[in-house]
């Protein structure tokens, strides 16, 4: 699987999940988020050669087409597959609020 366990441990040029840390205050200007200060959002990147974690039969065909026709622009894209939520703490006035935000952390990628 093209997940963090594999991708973060290997120098992989093809489609894989890459680490990306986002600081809420410094990177986004969201000063109101109390905790966490930031988090690993991660992202997917890298080429999608034939049969690399193909998501659908379409992406399999597209990957094969691109392999046999390297000059063609059509090829599968490396996109998130599994995402996990992130829990944040912020304050409304002095009242603490906890929110679980869905699909915030990319854990694995796929070619689609």
């Amino acid at each position: 699987a093209l997940d963090t366990n594999y991708c973060f441990r290997n120098l992989e040029e093809n489609c894989c999940v890459r680490p990306l840390y986002i600081d809420f205050r410094q990177d986004l200007g969201w000063k109101w988020v109390h905790e966490p200060k930031g988090y690993y959002a991660n992202f997917c990147s890298g080429p999608c050669p034939y049969l690399r974690s193909a998501d659908t039969t379409h992406s399999t065909v597209l990957g094969l087409y691109n392999t046999l026709n390297p000059e063609a622009s059509a090829s599968p894209c490396c996109v998130p597959q599994d995402l996990e939520p992130l829990t944040i703490l912020y304050y409304v006035g002095r009242t603490p609020k906890v929110e679980q935000l869905s699909n915030m952390v990319v854990k694995s990628c796929k070619c689609s």
């Epitope: 200007g29 000063k31 109101w32 304050y91 409304v92 006035g93 002095r94 009242t95 609020k97 929110e99």
Partner: antibody, heavy 121, light 111 residues
Framework: EVQLVQSGAEVKKPGASVKVSCKTS????????MNWVRQAPGAGLDWMGQ????????NYNEMFEGRVTLTADTSTSTAYMELSSLRAGDIAVYYC??????????????WGQGTLVTVSS | DIVMTQTPPSLSVSPRETASISCRAS??????????MHWYLQKPGQSPQLLIY???NLESGVSDRFSGSGSGTDFTLRISRVEANDTGVYYC?????????FGQGTKLELK
């Protein structure tokens, strides 16, 4: 230039719902909280609630008894306020107003032009 | 809810004089070293505009004739050398407690 442009005046019957839009430009919509404030004729200002467009998170003033729903469309940088079960006491000008940016609850540095909602049978 | 009480309800001032508006909160609006109190002016037929942020910070583009002071529960907005353009209703607002609340307004007129 930061602009908040609201939809036009509405006339509704008692018990109906109204949905007011607030189209923004000149800043990054997903970076700031959007507040809604209402002002009854000749009266002061009442905070209704707020939304954080990037995540759809909302905080409401209990005064509005769950009748208000705030939403946002990040693709068009537009915020919406829907008020249901309208009554005569809801006749007011409704404003959208951008939060200053340091806190969730905050001052409001840019305001829409206001939308007059009239409730009449 | 924190109740904000403004005095006076209305004020008539001669041009070039100084106007003072008071705002008293039903409980302290101070936290973390800040006073969470702000001031707005609503000119006739217009939307409110922010004048003072966090009790004493002048908002960008606002005349330095406006100044704010105070902490805890008692706050003051001063307008020096009052001009015709200053007429309207002034509101204080707190955001230290949910829900955010406004004062009832002070109407400033010129003599």
């Amino acid at each position: 230039e930061v602009q908040l442009v609201q939809s036009g005046a509405e006339v509704k019957k008692p018990g109906a719902s109204v949905k007011v839009s607030c189209k923004t430009s000149g800043y990054i919509f997903m970076k700031y909280w959007m507040n809604w404030v209402r002002q009854a004729p000749g009266a002061g200002l009442d905070w209704m609630g707020q939304i954080f467009p990037a995540w759809g998170m909302t905080n409401y003033n209990e005064m509005f008894e769950g009748r208000v729903t705030l939403t946002a469309d990040t693709s068009t940088s537009t915020a919406y306020m829907e008020l249901s079960s309208l009554r005569a006491g809801d006749i007011a000008v409704y404003y959208c107003a951008r939060g200053y940016g340091n806190y969730a609850l905050d001052a409001m540095d840019y305001w829409g032009q206001g939308t007059l909602v009239t409730v009449s049978s | 809810d924190i109740v904000m009480t403004q005095t006076p309800p209305s004020l008539s001032v001669s041009p070039r004089e100084t106007a003072s508006i008071s705002c008293r909160a039903s409980e302290s609006v101070d936290s973390y070293g800040n006073s969470f109190m702000h001031w707005y002016l609503q000119k006739p037929g217009q939307s409110p505009q922010l004048l003072i942020y966090l009790a004493s910070n002048l908002e960008s583009g606002v005349s330095d004739r406006f100044s704010g002071s105070g902490s805890g529960t008692d706050f003051t907005l001063r307008i020096s050398r009052v001009e015709a353009n200053d007429t309207g209703v002034y509101y204080c607002q707190q955001n230290n407690e949910d829900p955010l609340t406004f004062g009832q307004g002070t109407k400033l007129e010129l003599k």
